[in-house]
Interface confidence: low
């Protein structure tokens, strides 16, 4: 009985198409597959950013795979050929591993790269990113931001920079069509006459960095002698009502502070007839049904009732 062996895939490589972290892993079939013409060969691919604890594992019949990586770090990948048991009259046969790595050689010392990068997708409409110059750069250093997401033909440069002292410290993005629920890649690089500048790479999904507008039209309605209903409206914009969580802060007679988080645009408050003053503010955030994370809006304007019988009055801002 001769032992069945299979070679690893050939020409295994990681290709950078210039999408700021979205890379192609590709390979060719192994040599000497003639014996297994009737067989569908599979490949087991493992890859990770260098320093990551775990490998991502893919089993595929294709000769390529695409995924996003953090280009601030190196990437390592390995692949081997799998012959299913149907091809070998017994157990699955695996080749040895073919391995490859990819790394963007860092230019410049770490101090030169941008600091405190912060991106906010205001009201699910306008993306704005800001940063501070590296702690080791002169005023002649300028930073440039490039971005890409699936749907763009190539990486685009920011066309509307925010400036301070002549340096780019932020970017206002144009309308980003069909850009949410997918990885959004950013590279901020720089140039200086004096020395090379370290590039920084960032990846996020836009729906996870949304900061909504605050709620509007806060109202009180007396529901019963001991209950008041607080109501408000969602702000204008593309975010549907089902995507909001709200936090309310209620102050009663300048003493009691109640905070609550709710999913609807109403909150019923237990109160007493002695209540002389009631004020509340609300803020909103995209909830877990629409995103994995989010940023609280600013607080709404304060709405107060003071000095009149709440049972006789409904207040509208």
């Amino acid at each position: 009985d001769t032992e069945i062996k299979v070679n690893p895939p050939q020409d295994f490589e990681i290709v950078d198409p210039g999408y700021l972290g979205y890379l192609y892993l590709q390979w060719q079939p192994p040599l000497s597959l003639d014996h297994f013409k009737e067989c569908t060969v599979e490949y087991e691919l493992k890859y990770r950013n260098i320093g990551s604890e775990t490998w991502k594992t893919i089993i595929t019949k294709n000769l390529h795979y695409k995924d996003g990586f953090d280009l601030n770090k190196g990437i390592e990948a390995k692949i081997h050929t799998l012959l299913p048991w149907q091809c070998t009259n017994g157990s699955e046969v695996q080749s040895s591993w073919a391995e490859t790595t990819y790394w963007i050689s860092p230019q410049g010392i770490p101090e030169t790269k941008v600091q405190d990068m912060d991106c906010v997708y205001y009201n699910w409409q306008y993306l704005l990113c800001s940063w501070k110059p590296g702690i080791g750069v002169l005023l002649d250093t300028n930073y440039n931001l490039f971005y890409w997401y699936e749907g763009l033909d190539h990486a685009l440069q920011c066309v509307d920079y925010i400036k301070a002292d002549g340096q780019n410290i932020g970017c206002r993005f144009p309308y980003l069509e069909a850009s949410d629920y997918k990885d959004f890649y950013i590279c901020v690089n720089g140039s200086s006459e004096n020395k090379p500048i370290r590039s920084s790479y960032f990846t996020f999904q836009l729906q996870n960095i949304v900061k909504p507008l605050p709620p509007v039209y806060l109202t009180f309605t007396r529901e019963s002698s001991c209950e008041i209903k607080l109501k408000w409206s969602i702000p204008l914009g593309p975010i549907p009502a089902r995507c909001f969580d709200y936090e309310i802060e209620i102050r009663e007679d300048d003493t009691t502070l109640v905070t609550a988080t709710v999913e609807n645009e109403t909150y019923t408050l237990k109160t007493t007839n002695e209540t002389r003053q009631l004020c509340f503010v609300v803020r909103s955030k995209v909830n877990i049904y629409c995103s994995d994370d989010g940023i609280w809006s600013e607080w709404s304007d304060k709405q107060c009732w003071e000095g009149e019988d709440l049972s006789k009055k409904t207040l509208l801002r």
């Epitope: 260098i50 601030n72 770090k73 190196g74 101090e111 702690i135």
Partner: antibody
Framework: QVQLVQSGAEVVKPGASVKLSCKAS????????MNWVKQAPGQGLEWIGR????????HYNQKFKDRATLTVDKSTSTVYMELSSLRSEDTAVYYC????????????WGQGTLVTVSS | DIQLTQSPSSLSASVGDRVTITCRAS??????????MNWFQQKPGKAPKLLIY???RQGSGDPARFSGSGSGTDFTLTISSLQPEDFATYFC?????????FGGGTKVEIK
């Protein structure tokens, strides 16, 4: 978490060499420099040199340049320092310490290796 | 080489005291608008621990009672309210140019 584990204590004769190791874990090894620092018994701290774990570039204190050699093995995330032509004043604790860039300080240190030079 | 002179070389203080240690460099350690000055704490038999980098930025996880200030040639480490675990030796260190150099140390002892 970040860990720098250094090799054990050494007793060596004058004129001999010693090779100390520092194995790193818990971070992306090649993103950082590794420094070596000497502390003689009851004395202060003295910087020997550093090596870029990515490119292998080295910077030395001139005082140690002829006798200290820093090397890196990326496959095992280990940095080595070989000290040659040892003399009694080389008796000290030698520390490895990680550094990100010049302005960021040496933020994680190994436990130290005691080298005793004695005939 | 840049020489660093620390003062005092030792001091006695009580828990709760405000303690100030100074470090003077033989030439400016500023570059690119950064002061390349770091502060370390070392306890007997232990490796040094980074407290402050770039003159005034706190190391990760260090208590807020440690603060650094200064620029150019004169730098200060301040412990706002000395705690029992703060009795140790403190070193300044410059990283503006090779060779990196350390101050001689300041030993903080219990009064």
């Amino acid at each position: 978490q970040v860990q720098l584990v250094q090799s054990g204590a050494e007793v060596v004769k004058p004129g001999a060499s010693v090779k100390l190791s520092c194995k790193a874990s818990g971070y992306t090894f090649t993103n950082y420099w590794m420094n070596w620092v000497k502390q003689a018994p009851g004395q202060g701290l003295e910087w020997i040199g550093r090596i870029d774990a990515y490119a292998g570039e080295t910077h030395y204190n001139q005082k140690f340049k002829d006798r200290a050699t820093l090397t890196v093995d990326k496959s095992t995330s280990t940095v080595y320092m070989e000290l040659s032509s040892l003399r009694s004043e080389d008796t000290a604790v030698y520390y490895c310490a990680r550094g990100y860039g010049d302005a960021y300080g040496m933020d994680h240190w190994g436990q130290g290796t005691l080298v005793t030079v004695s005939s | 080489d840049i020489q660093l002179t620390q003062s005092p070389s030792s001091l006695s203080a009580s828990v709760g005291d405000r303690v100030t240690i100074t470090c003077r460099a033989s030439e400016s350690v500023d570059n690119y608008g950064i002061s390349f000055m770091n502060w370390f704490q070392q306890k007997p038999g232990k490796a040094p621990k980074l407290l402050i980098y770039a003159a005034s930025r706190q190391g990760s996880g260090d208590p807020a009672r440690f603060s650094g200030s200064g620029s150019g040639t004169d730098f200060t480490l301040t412990i706002s309210s000395l705690q029992p675990e703060d009795f140790a030796t403190y070193f300044c260190q410059q990283s503006k140019e090779v060779p990196w150099t350390f101050g001689g140390g300041t030993k903080v002892e219990i009064k």
